[in-house]
Interface confidence: low
């Protein structure tokens, strides 16, 4: 199609012939050349020759690894981006005659810039720090310090800070406090109870034993009324071994004031003041 000046449309060709004036602007998808408006080449094609009064703009498709992504008057197509594996890049989206190749980084790496010209390994978060945001193809790992109540004991590019174990929910007690790098250590509550309960039990048994020995002594007094003045014993001896200890120790019986007294071997024979009298 022959390209004519724009004034032909506006004022008619006759007027233009009398007062020729070059166009100052062209329509969309056109360009001005040699006082004429020529069609731009469509995306995926490059310019071979401009239009004339008698010929259309001549365009040619881009080659195998080339592209042009806009309406253009370029005489050369652009080369597709090369995703250099030596820079850690790989093809995310293959280029066409109208689009460039899109590169991305290999697994474990991210782009160093928006243009993704090279890659860098994802950073990991050290123990005491957790991952706030996992790295993407374009951004590095974002770490944050583990707050009180949380911990991280590994270097990782994925692990967040973990909450301390709740001993209470497991019916356990905290045996060792947690830190930002270590979890709390839980233990059975029995240990704590035992520390309190065992001495109490022993105390009770001890008191019962005292009472029993006292009652036994009182019960063993002669029933016939002896002409002894009534006196309380001044000393009471009870066995050193608590209940449950070895009771098979050899014993000997002696008579004190007509009352048999059982005496263990190896124990000092002591008689109450009342019995000696």
């Amino acid at each position: 199609m022959v390209r004519l000046p724009l004034q032909c449309v506006l004022w008619g060709c006759l007027l233009t012939a009398v007062h020729p004036e070059p166009p100052t602007a062209c329509r969309e998808k056109q360009y001005l050349i040699n006082s004429q408006c020529c069609s731009l080449c469509q995306p995926g094609q490059k310019l071979v020759s401009d239009c004339t009064e008698f010929t259309e703009t001549e365009c040619l498709p881009c080659g195998e690894s080339e592209f042009l992504d806009t309406w253009n008057r370029e005489t050369h197509c652009h080369q597709h981006k090369y995703c250099d594996p030596n820079l850690g890049l790989r093809v995310q989206q293959k280029g066409t005659s109208e689009t460039d190749t899109i590169c991305t980084c290999e697994e474990g790496w991210h782009c160093t810039s928006e243009a993704c010209e090279s890659c860098v390994l994802h950073r990991s978060c050290s123990p005491g720090f957790g991952v706030k945001q996992i790295a993407t193809g374009v951004s590095d790992t974002i770490c944050e310090p583990c707050p009180v109540g949380f911990f991280s004991n590994v270097s990782s590019a994925f692990e967040k800070c973990h909450p301390w174990t709740s001993c209470e929910t497991k019916d356990l007690v905290v045996q060792q406090a947690g830190t930002n790098k270590t979890d709390v250590v839980c233990g059975p509550q029995d240990r704590l109870r035992a520390l309190v309960v065992i001495p109490i039990i022993f105390g009770i048994l001890f008191a019962i034993l005292l009472v029993l020995v006292f009652i036994k002594k009182v019960a063993k007094k002669p029933t016939n009324k002896a002409p002894h003045p009534k006196q309380e014993p001044q000393e009471i001896n009870f066995p050193d071994d608590l209940p449950g200890s070895n009771t098979a120790a050899p014993v000997q019986e002696t008579l004190h004031g007509c009352q048999p007294v059982t005496q263990e071997d190896g124990k000092e024979s002591r008689i109450s003041v009342q019995e000696r009298q």
Partner: antibody
Framework: CQSLEESGGDLVKPGASLTLTCTAS????????MCWVRQAPGKGLEWIAC????????TYYASWAKGRFTISQTSSTTVTLQLTGLTPADTATYFC?????????????WGPGTLVTVSS | DIVMTQTPSSASEPVGGTVTIKCQAS??????LAWYQQKPGQPPKLLIY???TLASGVSSRFKGSGSGTQFTLTISDLECADAATYYC??????????FGGGTEVVVK
């Protein structure tokens, strides 16, 4: 204690080929990087190549090493380095090394090295 | 490839002195830098990672600083045991682990 050990170092003639092997003890290569570094007698350290032992299995070379040297993982505990077209300039102690994610990929594990001598 | 340039190539200081080693990256590597100590016949030992974080068991006399392209390792109160070669390394930035040329530290 985790360790790395290189083997395969030898005295060879120029133009010969050689395969070096790095064997891990008490750990396996699971989604980690394994590298080879060399050091010519009385010279500095020179990075050769690294391989990623994860699913993507990428390999990365110093520009001077591309084409002549090939790094590959041969099992869960071994990585090899194939050397071809050897010249006297390749005479060096070859170290197997493991960069660590916890150290921003600095190398915290090294083997003792294996000596490759290229001489006619 | 990223190129790491380390200066000086050697440094000599008396016991109790201070040594400063510089490392420059050919492009910004953020804080992806490690420092190693190597003694003859041994593999390198990690001293500092993430430009300034001390590896476990490393003396606080070792101090790393910097980010982007300029990094520094400072060793204060030098001891005889600090005599070694020190290397900087870019760690996993743009899939590259290049080392600096190394600095030999002599303690007088």
């Amino acid at each position: 204690c985790q360790s790395l050990e290189e083997s395969g170092g030898d005295l060879v003639k120029p133009g010969a080929s050689l395969t070096l092997t790095c064997t891990a003890s008490r750990f396996s290569f699971s989604s980690t990087y394994m590298c080879w570094v060399r050091q010519a007698p009385g010279k500095g350290l020179e990075w050769i190549a690294c391989t990623y032992t994860g699913s993507s299995g990428g390999t990365y070379y110093a520009s001077w090493a591309k084409g002549r040297f090939t790094i590959s993982q041969t099992s869960s505990t071994t990585v090899t380095l194939q050397l071809t077209g050897l010249t006297p300039a390749d005479t060096a102690t070859y170290f197997c090394a493991r960069p660590d994610v916890g150290f921003d990929f600095a190398i915290n594990f090294w083997g003792p090295g294996t000596l490759v001598t290229v001489s006619s | 490839d990223i190129v790491m340039t380390q200066t000086p190539s050697s440094a000599s200081e008396p016991v109790g002195g201070t040594v400063t080693i510089k490392c420059q990256a050919s492009q910004s590597i953020s804080s992806r830098l490690a420092w190693y100590q190597q003694k003859p016949g041994q593999p390198p030992k990690l001293l500092i990672y993430r430009a300034s974080t001390l590896a476990s068991g490393v003396s606080s006399r070792f101090k790393g600083s910097g980010s982007g392209t300029q990094f520094t390792l400072t060793i204060s109160d030098l001891e005889c045991a600090d005599a070694a070669t020190y290397y900087c390394q870019c760690t996993g930035y743009t899939i590259s682990w290049p080392f600096g040329g190394g600095t030999e530290v002599v303690v007088k």
